[in-house]
């Protein structure tokens, strides 16, 4: 299942948390490529068979997306070229918590990184003056 004959590229993720019912961001950056059409971004979630999101050839490719994420994901398409593969997750659910993998393929090589995503009912602390 691996890609042969390609170098590794650096992929960096940041653990984050999402508020149930709101939109969340799963952060991922990578070594950019000069050609958008050479970049493939795949987001996966442990315990989920289908893809969370896929972006390739300059656009979203949602055909192999898992049912539980349909209509709820987006990447920042205009920022992919500069190495931003972060995922926007709409209407965060409790079941969205878990381990995600940001998997990147470019003309330079491939790489991936995991991130832990927590979900809950987080509120901003009240500050009394």
């Amino acid at each position: 299942f691996g890609i042969s004959g390609r170098h590794s590229i650096t992929v960096t993720t940041v653990a984050s948390a999402g508020n149930i019912g709101e939109d969340g961001i799963l952060s991922c950056t990578f070594e950019p490529d000069i050609k958008l059409s050479d970049i493939v971004i795949q987001w996966l979630k442990e315990g989920v068979l289908g893809l969370v999101h896929e972006f390739k050839e300059g656009k979203d490719e949602l055909s192999e997306q898992d049912e539980m994420f349909r209509g709820r994901t987006a990447v920042f398409a205009d920022q992919v070229i500069v190495g931003n593969a972060s995922l926007r997750l709409k209407n965060v659910q409790l079941t969205d918590a878990g381990t995600y993998k940001c998997y990147i393929i470019t003309s330079k090589g491939k790489g991936n990184a995991n991130l832990e995503y927590k979900t809950g009912a987080f509120s901003m602390p009240e500050v009394n003056v």
Partner: antibody
Framework: QVQLVQSGAEVKKPGSSVKVSCKAS????????IHWVRQAPGQGLEWMGG????????KYAQNFQGRVTITADESTSTAYMELSSLRSEDTAVYYC?????????WGQGTTVTVSS | DIVMTQSPDSLAVSLGERATINCKSS????????????LAWYQQKPGQPPKLLIY???TRGSGVPDRFSGSGSGTDFTLTISSLQAEDVATYFC?????????FGQGTKVEIK
Amino acid sequence: QVQLVQSGAEVKKPGSSVKVSCKASGDTFTTYQIHWVRQAPGQGLEWMGGIMPIFGTTKYAQNFQGRVTITADESTSTAYMELSSLRSEDTAVYYCARRNYGMDVWGQGTTVTVSS
Amino acid sequence: DIVMTQSPDSLAVSLGERATINCKSSQSLLYRPVNKNFLAWYQQKPGQPPKLLIYWASTRGSGVPDRFSGSGSGTDFTLTISSLQAEDVATYFCQQYYSTPITFGQGTKVEIK
């Protein structure tokens, strides 16, 4: 060109287990799902389950829940399907297939015969 | 689970004539955000694995002759062989991949009349 090559035919006794392998060759992503489908003699196609090799995430058909285990070894690009507590009605050809807009690449099939 | 029902179970057609196979799903296979039907058609010859003919209900697979075409949307789909050739004798299956469990139609056997 991706190819899926399966292990050879097996003859098993009722109550035993069988493990069938499916090796991927050629240039393919770790993020393609590999599915297992079986076909009893003269019958239709029955989906058993699938795996996402990069995470080892699996999903199984209700009919096989508890009896089937699908695994993958990324280092050898091989997926496995193990079926336990075999009975005569498990006699079938077992196929692995890559999911990509349907199932675009299939293994050649492995015949499993369950007989006492 | 989505139930797939094919008709007819078998079909005898003269060489050069049109063969039509129908497939009905128990729920819609159209995913509107991508405007695609998650339906595939396969051809299977004796002793061989299935071969992908059509995906997205109407897109021909790699190397599939243009006499094979798929149509339909939602719950009703059709596979058409415009001019039957001797090598088209096989069993044809529809399959939904809209959701798991993935399910197949029971198959339609195509023979020469």
